[in-house]
Amino acid sequence: EEELQVIQPDKSVSVAAGESAILHCTVTSLIPVGPIQWFRGAGPARELIYNQKEGHFPRVTTVSESTKRENMDFSISISNITPADAGTYYCVKFRKGSPDTEFKSGAGTELSVRAKPSAPVVSGPAARATPQHTVSFTCESHGFSPRDITLKWFKNGNELSDFQTNVDPVGESVSYSIHSTAKVVLTREDVHSQVICEVAHVTLQGDPLRGTANLSETIRVPPTLEVTQQPVRAENQVNVTCQVRKFYPQRLQLTWLENGNVSRTETASTVTENKDGTYNWMSWLLVNVSAHRDDVKLTCQVEHDGQPAVSKSHDLKVSAHPKEQGSNTAAENTGSNERNIY
């Protein structure tokens, strides 16, 4: 009689993570008597995947009634496949004895596992940066297989070209990770901008995964200051305004100085938002010029988002204004941005 052959018809099988893998195996004879076992890998370190008669293999079921005496189909199904299951599986016939001895092995079936990449996570710099500066964004995605993957960067829909990407590990692995770093030059208009990392993989069926970062969390647009003297509101009173324009984020503190002395400090609250996402704010002082003999140097000093203060000054000429007699008390309009100085 012809010697028993162990036939594994599939050289390779590819399965999506979470699905079941069917590994086919048939033998051509019932002789010699002895069990079939399935192993992953070859040699002394091979891993037992299924033993017909004993052991605990909760994920493995036989495709046919392999326990029937005349059965020659020893195909198995492995449930809930993960990337860790990848490898070459061998169907091995044993000859019964003391102990059982390996009689013949199939040629092996290579199981590859298609695993989706995790949602890309995009992270930006730890500290805010100002326009014209170049900042780095990183994108990471893990757990995918096979290794081939495509990663693209976009800023507001425009593809970026200045980036570096690594897929790890370099050699064979059950699953892989991708890490990419993109360089982005900030502009004053970037408060509403988004940086997008897009990952395409065979498991995603043409529907790439995206991770985003809002540049509003990265950018700092410093304010421009303008101090102007408004027309006289009443006799001997001058309205001086400080226009704080185009700043982001909103965190801002303004201090008025008169001849170098602190007059008032306030925090930006009721700001107006520009179309580009930056903010404007205005503060003003009412100055009673009759209280001053000499010219007054008014300074608007702004500390924005914890940065060193910037300031703009305005020289208020008082020589042209006749002094009002007997006015030497100070009054403050609380709850507004006004300050009367006598």
Partner: antibody
Framework: EVQLVQSGAEVKKPGATVKISCKAS????????MHWVQQAPGKGLEWIGR????????KYAPKFQGRVTITADTSTNTAYMELSSLRSEDTAVYYC??????WGQGTLVTVSS | EIVLTQSPATLSLSPGERATLSCSAS???????LYWYQQKPGQAPKLWIY???NLASGIPARFSGSGSGTDYTLTISSLEPEDFAVYYC?????????FGQGTKLEIK
């Protein structure tokens, strides 16, 4: 549901023979090796042997070889373990198990004169 | 015959502590054939960990198994009151199959 129900406790005299049964349900014993394990009072587990009910092939631990006989009746889906020439040190709980994963509740055998 | 030696014989710990149980084989055992069982007084052993590191159905994730060759370990990351029992390692790599003598995990 896999279940292994063993026969009740036995009291035997030294030199006698005891035969314990293990009735299986929820599976066909022909499909699995059936093992027997001994546990003396306050002691650990000791593997006695196993049977392949499909062809009645057996394997025994050297310690029990010659005194133990494991059999199976596939028509009643039952495995048996017979231990002869009993001595006091054979006083123990005896467990059957299916393929190392599912265990019977145990049978206490007391050997006493 | 492969002799399995478990250490320590008794381990006294408090709930919340980490437990490490060792099983040393007199000759190499393939990791596929190394199992752990838990046994409580008056009960049959229960399969706890199979193929060195796989938890049997319903076993909490605080349990883990590791090892290869001749040295194997069962670890409980944070002991719960129900974990106090006797644990046996078992090899079925070659006949005769053997068990370790057991480690009794008791409440301190």
């Amino acid at each position: 549901e896999v279940q292994l129900v063993q026969s009740g406790a036995e009291v035997k005299k030294p030199g006698a023979t005891v035969k314990i049964s293990c009735k299986a349900s929820g599976f066909n014993i022909k499909d699995y090796y059936m093992h027997w394990v001994q546990q003396a009072p306050g002691k650990g587990l000791e593997w006695i042997g196993r049977i392949d009910p499909e062809d009645a092939e057996t394997k025994y631990a050297p310690k029990f070889q010659g005194r133990v006989t494991i059999t199976a009746d596939t028509s009643t889906n039952t495995a048996y373990m017979e231990l002869s020439s009993l001595r006091s040190e054979d006083t123990a709980v005896y467990y059957c198990d299916r393929g190392l994963a599912y265990w019977g509740q145990g049978t206490l055998v007391t050997v006493s004169s | 015959e492969i002799v399995l030696t478990q250490s320590p014989a008794t381990l006294s710990l408090s709930p919340g502590e980490r437990a490490t149980l060792s099983c040393s084989a007199s000759s190499s055992v393939s990791s596929s054939y190394l199992y752990w069982y838990q046994q409580k007084p008056g009960q049959a052993p229960k399969l706890w960990i199979y193929s060195t590191s796989n938890l049997a159905s319903g076993i909490p994730a605080r349990f883990s198994g590791s090892g290869s060759g001749t040295d194997y370990t069962l670890t409980i990351s944070s002991l719960e009151p129900e974990d106090f029992a006797v644990y046996y390692c078992h090899q079925w790599s070659s006949y005769p199959y053997t068990f370790g003598q057991g480690t009794k995990l008791e409440i301190k």
